[in-house]
């Protein structure tokens, strides 16, 4: 015998209290597939979360983060504070990248500058705390019309190159 509940479409649930007829999901709940015996409670985007997509009878609400924060985890399960470029988030808040490291994003950690010599290349542009080193072409790559590799100017202060 076919389960009568299998006829209940998304946005409804199979109501055991009413002879298994299909009842619409109550307010603030949803069912994203057919044949459900209950509707799920809609996610509420509160506090540092804000609503990106409202809940409907067939799909859950989606949250993102308020300005100054960014999403982490599947489905934006957490919001983490933004930092400025050239910084990383620590337990004590946003801290500047140490000399020799950079972060070009508002999230994540400071990473060491690229070591150009690992690829047999030289430094074309110095790194800063906001930007990675740029590696120049290896001598074999140079051809007419390509930039010649000029030695980098010494940095005027830790983590910064002259602009």
């Amino acid at each position: 015998l076919q389960d009568p509940c299998s006829n209940c479409p998304a946005g409804t649930f199979c109501d055991n209290n009413r002879n298994q007829i299909c009842s619409p999901c109550p307010p603030n709940s949803f069912s994203s597939a057919g044949g459900q015996r209950t509707c799920d409670i809609c996610r509420q985007c509160k506090g540092v979360f804000r609503t990106r997509k409202e809940c409907s009878s067939t799909s859950n609400a989606e949250c993102d983060c308020t300005p100054g924060f960014h999403c982490l985890g599947a489905g934006c399960s957490m919001c983490e504070q933004d930092c400025k470029q050239g910084q990383e988030l620590t337990k004590k808040g946003c801290k500047d990248c140490c000399f020799g490291t950079f972060n070009d994003q508002k999230r994540g950690i400071c990473r060491p500058w690229t070591n150009c010599s690992l690829d047999g290349k030289s430094v074309l542009v110095n790194g800063t705390k906001e930007r990675d080193v740029v590696c120049g072409p290896s001598p074999a790559d140079l051809s007419p019309g390509a930039s010649s590799v000029t030695p980098p100017a010494p940095a005027r202060e830790p983590g910064h190159s002259p602009q």
């Epitope: 470029q85 070009d104 999230r107 990473r111 690229t114 542009v125 906001e130 930007r131 990675d132 590696c135």
Partner: antibody, heavy 127, light 111 residues
């Protein structure tokens, strides 16, 4: 020689979906950031999304966030763009672009620009 | 409305020099590398300048890039008819967590 070949474009109704593919050859696909960039007829270039090869991190333009998903299959040397809830303003030529700066040696590709481009695939959104 | 501002058009006569500007802010051009692209009519863009001022192999030294503060410039000297194209600046914008393009400058070579 770097070659990028986009496919999957076509006519779709507003609210519909399309999946674009970009077949890459001539370079070590798994070592480079890859982007999708679009251009509506007679309009500017607009960056859509980027995916990193090392950590799989993805970033999107605000105009497509929550509707488009970029992905890659390094074993097939292929880049994808899944486009859902399409709107009239999504109609454009979609280019697949390879970034310079091979990873993991290079930590950030942003300095090197997009040094390889496909010829594009046209997406039309109309009822 | 693009985050990076370029003049919509520029022109020059063969042999002359033309400069195209690109203006942004501290979250993009000010702290990040600028790249320039050339798009000939009906074709895909081509990388012209990377890391503010460096040319990829094969790009003639008639093309040069520079940057000061939150603005960048592309200069083309010894203009040729084949330089007639759209030119786009681009960079990473950390506050948007994404790449941004200018809206392009259409270069016309007169005469």
């Amino acid at each position: 020689e770097v070659q990028l070949l986009e496919s999957g474009g076509g006519l779709v109704q507003p609210g519909g979906s399309l999946r674009l593919s970009c077949a890459a050859s001539g370079f070590t696909f798994s070592g480079y950031d890859m982007s999708w960039v679009r251009q509506a007829p007679g309009k500017c270039l607009e960056w859509v999304s980027v995916i990193y090869p090392d950590d799989g991190n993805t970033y999107y333009a605000d105009s497509v966030k929550g509707r488009f998903t970029i992905s890659r299959d390094n074993s097939k040397n292929t880049l994808y763009l899944q486009m859902n809830s399409l709107r009239a303003e999504d109609a454009a030529v979609y280019y697949c672009a390879k970034h310079g700066g091979q990873k993991p040696t290079t930590k950030s590709s942003s300095a090197y620009g997009m040094d390889g481009w496909g010829q594009g695939t046209l997406v039309t959104v109309s009822s | 409305q693009s985050v990076l501002t370029q003049p919509p058009s520029a022109s020059g006569t063969p042999g002359r020099r033309v400069t195209i500007s690109c203006s942004g802010s501290s979250s993009n051009i000010g702290n990040n590398y600028v790249t320039w692209y050339q798009q000939l009519p009906g074709t895909a863009p081509k990388l012209l300048i990377y890391a503010d001022s460096h040319r990829p192999s094969g790009v003639p030294d008639r093309f040069s890039g520079s940057k000061s503060g939150t603005s960048a410039s592309l200069a083309i000297s010894g203009l040729r008819s084949e330089d007639e194209a759209d030119y786009y600046c681009a960079t990473w914008d950390y506050s948007l967590s994404g790449y941004v393009f200018g809206c392009g400058t259409k270069l016309t070579v007169l005469g």
